[in-house]
Amino acid sequence: MSGLGRSRRGGRSRVDQEERFPQGLWTGVAMRSCPEEQYWDPLLGTCMSCKTICNHQSQRTCAAFCRSLSCRKEQGKFYDHLLRDCISCASICGQHPKQCAYFCENKLRSPVNLPPELRRQRSGEVENNSDNSGRYQGLEHRGSEASPALPGLKLSADQVALVYST
């Protein structure tokens, strides 16, 4: 199934489109703004999921979404929405966001693989992260504080939760 009815030229009604796309792919012919993670397809006259064109790099609107999607497919990495970059979990274990919990906690269980600074951290030599929540994970409980990714930037708890939600 093509997943799409006829476009506005082909004669399906807007109601029919809405039934086929309960997630709100249809924005109306005149409307060009689409929900997040969607782009306006001028050939169909509808909003479409960015997932459909990540292979094609053909829509600027989807660039950040497609980067984060491909990043999430890479093991041991997470997409930092502030830096707009794919970050290796290994580089931030001990102060990691929840997306890296699986990777970092497995790493911490086998200290042989750890870099010296993280081995010291495990034995309590590094004082400021001994609460084991880590700077990233603990952020949402601490109100406004500097972002670990961008030290000069102050973020509210809500903003932090938003930035690191997948």
Epitope: M1, S2, G3, L4, D41, L43, N55, H56, R60, A63
Partner: antibody
């Protein structure tokens, strides 16, 4: 409306390199979409060659990967196809085209390339 | 890459009758509930022109007599009623993945 126009040498000798140009008017190649090269052999078979996206990233047909490069000159709103070590098998009409979403919506008229000694 | 096999290679249809061109993909071109199959018409000395986009949606300014259908690996282009202006080559093309591939083409003529 966007318009694309190909230009090239027309005739090239085997083993030489060639460069084709696609000049785009009515739309900035850096503002959005992906900009492609497609070729059509005598007998009508169409083959996708590769693309350069609005951001400058490229992807090529694996069958040509080692021989091609697609670049651009943003100041002139042009993109180029460089093809190394050509053979008679590269004789074709070369089209440049724009991909909006997942389809070629605008094409140039094509430029004919003949590889012959 | 995905291989597209078009049939028949050539077709002669009487004016006013139905022309049906088939395209079979070596693997499914469906993704995220969408069939990434396009159809193009090409006349001599011209570039291909987009007729049908993602299996069943008409390109801009394409007459209603052109329609596309199918999903997965089997697709068809229907032209009804056949008009003189429809004499051309027709190609299917998949854009599910790179490398994009085209069918071998069908030459449509008037009987």
């Amino acid at each position: 409306d966007v318009q694309l126009q190909e230009s090239g040498p027309g005739l090239v000798k085997p083993s030489q390199s060639l460069s084709l140009t696609c000049t785009v008017s009515g739309f900035s190649i850096t503002s959005d979409y992906a900009w492609h090269w497609i070729r059509q052999f005598p007998g009508n078979k169409l083959e996708w060659v590769g693309y350069i996206s609005y951001s400058g990233s490229t992807r090529y047909n694996p069958s040509l990967n080692s021989r091609i490069s697609i670049t651009r000159d943003t100041s002139k709103n042009q993109f180029f196809l460089q093809l190394k070590s050509v053979t008679t098998e590269d004789t074709a009409t070369y089209f440049c085209a724009r991909v909006v979403s997942t389809s070629f919506d605008s094409w140039g008229l094509g430029t004919t390339l003949t590889v012959s000694s | 890459g995905i291989v597209l096999t078009q049939s028949p290679p050539s077709l002669a249809v009487s004016l006013g009758q139905r022309a049906t061109i088939s395209c079979r993909a070596s693997e499914s071109v469906d993704n995220y509930g969408i069939s990434f199959m396009n159809w193009f018409q090409q006349k001599p000395g011209q570039p291909p022109k987009l007729l049908i986009y993602v299996a069943s949606n008409q390109g801009s300014g394409v007459p209603a007599r052109f329609s596309g259908s199918g999903s997965g690996t089997d697709f068809s282009l229907n032209i009804h009623p056949m008009e003189e202006d429809d004499t051309a080559m027709y190609f299917c093309q998949q854009s599910k993945e790179v490398p994009y591939t085209f069918g071998g083409g069908t030459k449509l003529e008037i009987k």
